[in-house]
C-alpha cells in the first residue's frame, strides 16, 4: 500500500531513509536538458523474494537535443559538482547500510540523473531527519517518522525534531546538548 | 492517558514573580519539546518560547526575553515557566504544550496581578 | 515575524451547514500551519497539523488544505460541539505565530 503523502517536513531538516521497503518505487527523472529514453520505465520498483531485494528496471536519460541517442554530454562545471555530490551520497549510503530483509539499498546514480529523488513509499517505511549544515538541534525526540496506515487511511507520525540557527544554547549548568544522530548521513531529500 | 497538569490560578501582587509549573504524564516527557503561550482578552494567543525537555535548551520569542525563563526538571517531568516583575499586563492565561505540533495542551493558569 | 491572518472573526451558522474558515501567511510558509479549536473556558485541542493532515480522534467531518501563504479548515455537516473558535498558527521558523481567531456561533 502506497503511503498517500510525503513524509512530514521539518524546518532546516532534511530525511533519509536507510533503507527503502519492497514496493517502493523512484521516478526516472533527468537533470535539465535530458529525458527519459523512450522504451525506458517511468520509475523503478524495490521487488524482492524471501531471501533477497533489488530494485526492478533502470532509468536511463538521454539528451533533449539528440533524436535516439545516449551519448555521453559532457556536464558543465556545475553540474558536474551536483552530480559528484549525488554519486558521493549514493555511495555513502550504500556504505553504511545493512542488509535488511525486505528492504533495497539506496539505488545507484544514472547517467544525467535529476538533483533530487522522487520516492514514492509504502506503509512500514521508516525516513530519518537531521538538522542541515549550519543549525543545530534544539530538541531531539524520536527523529523520524513512520508511515502507518490507521483507519484505511495512510499517514506519517511526526517527528519530535526541532534544528535552530541561534547559536547560544541557553542550557542548564552542566548538560550538553543530545548527539546529533551520526553526522554524514547524506540527505536525500531536503525540506526547506 | 497523555496530561499536562497546570495549577489553575495564581493571584500576585505587582513587582513579583511567579513560577508556573507543567507536570507531563502518559507518555516518555524527554521525546517532546514543551512550548508555553499566553492567551490575553487583548492579544490573543502569543507564543513565549519552546524549551527542550532533554537539554534544558530554550528559544524564546523576543517579546518574552527578559520577561519569561523556561526550566525543566527531568526527574520530576515538569517544564516551568518563571515570569518576572509582574505588572497588570502580564495577567493572562499561561498554557504550556507539547511536542513539534503542540498536540496535547495543559488546562492553564489564569494569572492575576493585582494588588 | 510572520503575522497570520483570520479576516473573519466571527461566523454565524446553522446545524448541517458547510463551512470554511481561512487564514493567510504574511509569506511562504509552505505546509508548517496547525488549526486549533477552542471552547469557552477550555484548553485549544489539535484539529490539524502540516496544513491537511487530521490529529488523532479528529472527526473526519475536518479537513485542511493550502499551502504557502493561503490556507482554509472545512467543515462539513456542523454539529453542536464544532461551535467554539478557532485558531491557526505556524511552526514554520521561530517566534511561532497564531491567527487572531474566528469565533463560529450558531445562527
Known amino acids: 500500500e502506497l503511503c498517500d503523502d510525503d513524509p512530514p517536513k521539518i524546518t532546516h531538516a532534511t530525511f533519509k531513509a536507510v533503507a527503502y521497503k519492497e514496493g517502493t518505487m523512484l521516478n526516472c527523472e533527468c537533470k535539465r536538458g535530458f529525458r527519459r529514453i523512450k522504451s525506458g520505465s517511468p520509475y523503478m520498483l524495490c521487488t524482492g523474494n524471501s531471501s533477497h531485494s533489488s530494485w526492478d528496471n533502470q532509468c536511463q536519460c538521454t539528451s533533449s537535443a539528440a533524436r535516439n541517442t545516449t551519448k555521453q554530454v559532457t556536464p558543465q562545471p556545475e553540474e558536474q559538482k551536483e552530480r559528484k555530490t549525488t554519486e558521493m551520497q549514493s555511495q555513502m549510503q550504500l556504505a553504511d547500510q545493512v542488509s535488511l530483509p525486505g528492504h533495497c539499498r539506496e539505488p545507484p546514480p544514472w547517467e544525467n540523473e535529476a538533483t533530487e529523488r522522487i520516492y514514492h513509499f509504502v506503509v512500514g517505511q521508516t525516513v530519518y531527519y537531521q538538522c542541515v549544515q549550519g543549525y543545530r538541534a534544539l530538541h531531539r525526540g524520536p527523529a523520524e517518522s513512520v508511515c502507518k496506515m490507521t483507519h484505511g487511511k495512510t499517514r506519517w507520525t511526526q517527528p519530535q525534531l526541532i534544528c535552530t540557527g541561534e547559536t547560544e544554547p541557553s542550557q542548564f549548568p552542566g548538560e550538553e546538548e543530545p548527539q546529533a544522530s551520526p553526522d554524514g548521513l547524506p540527505e536525500s531529500e531536503t525540506s526547506r | 492517558q497523555i496530561q499536562l497538569q497546570q495549577p489553575g490560578a495564581e493571584l500576585v501582587r505587582p513587582g513579583v514573580s511567579l513560577k508556573i509549573s507543567c507536570k507531563g504524564s502518559?507518555?516518555?516527557?524527554?521525546?517532546?519539546?514543551m512550548h508555553w503561550v499566553r492567551q490575553s482578552h487583548a492579544k490573543s494567543l502569543e507564543w513565549i518560547g519552546v524549551?527542550?525537555?532533554?537539554?534544558?535548551?530554550?528559544i524564546y520569542n523576543q517579546k518574552f526575553k527578559g520577561k519569561a525563563t523556561m526550566t525543566v526538571d527531568k526527574s520530576s517531568s515538569t517544564a516551568y515557566l518563571e515570569l518576572a516583575r509582574l505588572t497588570s499586563d502580564d495577567s493572562a492565561i499561561y498554557y504550556c504544550?507539547?511536542?513539534?505540533?503542540?498536540?496535547?495542551w495543559g488546562q492553564g493558569t489564569t494569572v492575576t496581578v493585582s494588588s | 515575524d510572520i503575522q497570520m491572518t483570520q479576516t473573519t472573526s466571527s461566523l454565524s451558522a446553522s446545524l448541517g451547514d458547510r463551512v470554511t474558515i481561512t487564514c493567510r501567511a504574511s509569506?511562504?510558509?509552505?505546509?508548517?500551519l496547525e488549526w486549533y479549536q477552542q471552547k469557552q473556558g477550555k484548553s485549544p485541542q489539535l484539529l490539524v497539523y502540516n496544513a491537511k493532515t487530521l490529529a488523532e480522534g479528529v472527526p473526519s467531518r475536518f479537513s485542511g488544505s493550502g499551502s504557502g501563504t493561503q490556507f482554509s479548515l472545512k467543515i462539513n455537516s456542523l454539529q453542536p460541539e464544532d461551535f467554539g473558535s478557532y485558531y491557526c498558527q505556524h511552526h514554520y521558523d521561530t517566534p511561532y505565530t497564531f491567527g487572531g481567531g474566528t469565533k463560529l456561533e450558531i445562527k
Open positions: 504544550a507539547r511536542g513539534v505540533t503542540f498536540d496535547y
Open positions: 524549551i527542550s525537555t532533554y537539554s534544558g535548551d530554550a
Open positions: 509569506q511562504d510558509i509552505s505546509n508548517y
Open positions: 502518559g507518555y516518555t516527557f524527554t521525546d517532546y519539546a
